[in-house]
C-alpha cells in the first residue's frame, strides 16, 4: 500500500505479480514529489496496491481502465 506523508501518497515498493483485472476499479498516479514513480490500483474492496508503471501488465490495465 502507498505510504502517506502530508497527504501525498508515495510508493516504496511495487507488486510484481499481476492483480486480477476484474478486481480493479480505478487507479491513480502518485505525485511527482515522490522518489519512485508509481501507479496505485484501487481494488473493489478499496485496497490500494502500488505498481510499477513500466511493467507491461500495468500499462495494459491502465489502457483498459481508460477505455471502460
Amino acid at each position: 500500500s502507498p505510504y502517506s506523508s502530508d497527504t501525498t501518497p508515495c510508493c516504496f515498493a511495487y507488486i510484481a505479480r499481476p492483480l486480477p483485472r476484474a478486481h480493479i476499479k480505478e487507479y491513480f498516479y502518485t505525485s511527482g514529489k515522490c522518489s519512485n514513480p508509481a501507479v496505485v490500483f484501487v481494488t473493489r474492496k478499496n485496497r490500494q496496491v502500488c505498481a510499477n508503471p513500466e511493467k507491461k501488465w500495468v500499462r495494459e490495465y491502465i489502457n483498459s481502465l481508460e477505455m471502460s
Partner: antibody, heavy 119, light 108 residues
C-alpha cells in the same frame, strides 16, 4: 529460504474428493500468493487457481470452478486444495507454488502430490 | 482464452545453442516466464519478465519477446539442461495464468 512441503500420495475412487496440503516454512504464508498447478501423466502444466492476498480472494481457473476449493490456515502456515467429484482424468501430480510479492513468476514449488483416481 | 504454442521437441548437440519458442497473439504485450522441469521433479523458474534471470540461474539462459513469439535461448548447452521447458503468461481477459504445452529439450 522458502520451502513448500506437500502431503503424500492419494488413491481415490471416482466421485470422491481429495484434499492436498502444502506447508510453508522459512516465511509466513501471508507473505505469498499460493497457487495450485497440476500435471497429468505425460502432459503439460495446468494452472488451477490461486489466492490473491491484496484482495483476500481466491481465483479459480474456469475449468475447475465449482469443483475446487483452495483454503489457507495461517496459524499453521498451511495451504489446502480440495478437488471434488473426482474422475479418472483428474489423475495427476498436484503442485503448490508460491507467487512472491516482489518477484514475478511462480517460485518455489512444492515437491508435488500424486493423486490417482481409479475404481 | 489466450493460447501459447510451443514446439513439442527441440534437439541440440552439447556446446551448441538451443532456442525454444513460445507463440501467442501479440505476445510482446505480455510478460513471459519460463520454467525448466526435469523428470520426476517440480518446475523451476529460469527466466521471468521476458528476459530476467532469478538468482542462481546460469547466464547461459536468456529470453526475448517480440511480435508473436517469445524465445528462451540456452547457449553452450550441457547434458544437464535436458528437460521440459514451459512458457507462461498472465491472461488479463480471463484473469488466468496460462502455460504453453511444453517443449522437450534433448541433448544429443
Amino acid at each position: 529460504q522458502v520451502q513448500l512441503v506437500q502431503s503424500g500420495a492419494e488413491v481415490k475412487k471416482p466421485g470422491a474428493s481429495v484434499k492436498v496440503s502444502c506447508k510453508v516454512s522459512g516465511y509466513t504464508l501471508t507473505e505469498f500468493a499460493m497457487h495450485w498447478v497440476r500435471q497429468a501423466p505425460g502432459k503439460g502444466l495446468e494452472w488451477m487457481g490461486g489466492f490473491v492476498p491484496e484482495d483476500g480472494e481466491t481465483i479459480y481457473a474456469q475449468k475447475f470452478q465449482g469443483r475446487v476449493t483452495m483454503t489457507e490456515d495461517t496459524s499453521t502456515d498451511t495451504a489446502y486444495m480440495e478437488l471434488s467429484s473426482l474422475r479418472s482424468e483428474d489423475t495427476a501430480v498436484y503442485y503448490c507454488a508460491t507467487d512472491p510479492l516482489y518477484t514475478p513468476g511462480l517460485e518455489p514449488w512444492g515437491q508435488g502430490t500424486t493423486v490417482t483416481v481409479s475404481s | 482464452s489466450y493460447v501459447l504454442t510451443q514446439p513439442p521437441s527441440v534437439s541440440v548437440a552439447p556446446g551448441q545453442t538451443a532456442r525454444i519458442t513460445c507463440g501467442g497473439n501479440n505476445i510482446e504485450s505480455k510478460s513471459v516466464h519460463w520454467y525448466q522441469q526435469k523428470p520426476g521433479q517440480a518446475p523451476v523458474l529460469v527466466v521471468y519478465d521476458d528476459s530476467d534471470r532469478p538468482s542462481g540461474i546460469p547466464e547461459r539462459f536468456s529470453g526475448s519477446n517480440s511480435g508473436n513469439t517469445a524465445t528462451l535461448t540456452i547457449s553452450r548447452v550441457e547434458a544437464g539442461d535436458e528437460a521440459d521447458y514451459y512458457c507462461q503468461v498472465w491472461d488479463s481477459n480471463t484473469d488466468h495464468w496460462v502455460f504453453g504445452g511444453g517443449t522437450k529439450l534433448t541433448v544429443l
